[in-house]
């Protein structure tokens, strides 16, 4: 069964800046990755970025830079300033759509300590 992992890290240089990394563990070709915050995309979450392997990347504030790290993992940097900036207990979710298997999603938030955390 495919799985999704989510890692949330606060940047040491900018304490209100976050990096979210997500990956897909499974076969099948990834068709779309959706990153949201405040919960899963279908349950009240707000979309931060949508990454398509062929048609490019769309992102919305406070997302600053979304990119593919590998064919099955992505990263997203969030701008730290402004009213829409995330706080330490914000939940971030990643949904990977793989054809023809379907979609898998997982959520994560900043770990209690300042160490990078892994949530699957």
């Amino acid at each position: 069964t495919p799985e999704v992992w989510v890692q949330v890290r606060m940047e040491a240089t900018e304490l209100s800046s976050f990096t979210i990394r997500c990956g897909f563990l499974g076969s099948g070709s990834i068709s779309l990755v959706t990153v949201s915050w405040g919960g899963p995309n279908g349950a009240g979450g707000t979309t931060l970025a949508v990454l398509h392997p062929e048609r490019g990347i769309r992102q919305w504030a406070p997302a600053r830079q979304a990119r593919w790290e590998t064919q099955s993992s992505i990263s997203l940097i969030l701008e730290g300033s402004g009213a829409s900036s995330p706080c330490a207990n914000t939940t971030f979710c990643c949904k990977f759509a793989s054809f023809p298997e379907g979609s898998w999603e997982a959520c994560g938030s900043l770990p209690p300590s300042s160490d990078p955390g892994l949530s699957a």
Epitope: G28, S29, E54, R55, A97, S103
Partner: antibody
């Protein structure tokens, strides 16, 4: 304008074979996942086969596994369904459809359908 | 496989009526739900994707809502051309499965 045009349906005896074709135009065929969906007379819709845009991943339900084969020819902008060992319960209108990644794999374009009748 | 149970299976209504069709998934399907309209002898047409997004050219009287396992298609004011069969579909997990359909007839 996106167009999908099926052909190859007809009357065939139980145990016989048919090859359905779907000619695509008006879009970059190689960028889309494709499926065959059938509808028995007076019944609902059933996915019978799907193929990823790169052609590497396919799906078949148990009802047709081992008897049907989906394939695509991106140079010809065509989708195919080879149907062997046909049974009376395969009688249906067969539709070719296109999946849109950005719509959660919803099928945003359909052909007009081609009728397959399996009868002795 | 995820089962999509649609209700009612048939419905009689009049032009101008507000109509609601429901679809219940056997497990959570996130927001990967679409609705299709099919008229006799024709192919299905996409109406709604991602639960609530209207496809290009679909009139605003059609709306979708729901989350998790329970979804609804609403037609706010029926028009003569809306009498057709409607199907829900989940595209969350393979195989994509459809509801059994709701036939909307003129009262």
């Amino acid at each position: 304008e996106v167009q999908l045009v099926e052909s190859g349906g007809g009357l065939v005896k139980p145990g016989g074979s048919l090859r359905l074709s779907c000619a695509a135009s008006g879009f970059t065929f190689s960028s889309y996942h494709m499926s065959w969906v059938r509808q028995a007379p007076g019944k609902g819709l059933e996915l019978v086969s799907a193929i990823s845009r790169d052609g590497d991943s396919t799906y078949y339900p148990d009802t047709v596994k081992g008897r049907f084969t989906i394939s695509r020819d991106d140079a010809e902008n065509s989708l195919y369904l080879q149907m062997n060992s046909l049974r009376a319960e395969d009688t249906a209108v067969y539709y070719c459809s296109r999946h849109e990644d950005y719509f959660g794999f919803a099928m945003d374009s359909w052909g007009q359908g081609t009728l397959v009748t399996v009868s002795s | 496989d995820i089962q999509m149970t649609q209700s009612p299976s048939s419905l009689s209504a009049s032009v101008g009526d507000r109509v609601t069709i429901t679809c219940k998934a056997s497990q959570s399907v996130s927001n990967d739900v679409a609705w299709y309209q099919q008229k006799p002898g024709k192919a299905p047409k996409l109406l709604i994707y991602y639960v609530s997004n209207r496809f290009t050219g679909v009139p605003s009287r059609f709306s979708g809502s729901g989350s998790g396992t329970d979804f609804t298609l609403t037609i706010s004011s029926l028009q003569p051309e809306d009498f057709a069969t409607y199907f829900c579909q989940q595209a969350y997990r393979s195989p994509w499965t459809f509801g059994q359909g709701t036939k909307l007839e003129i009262k």
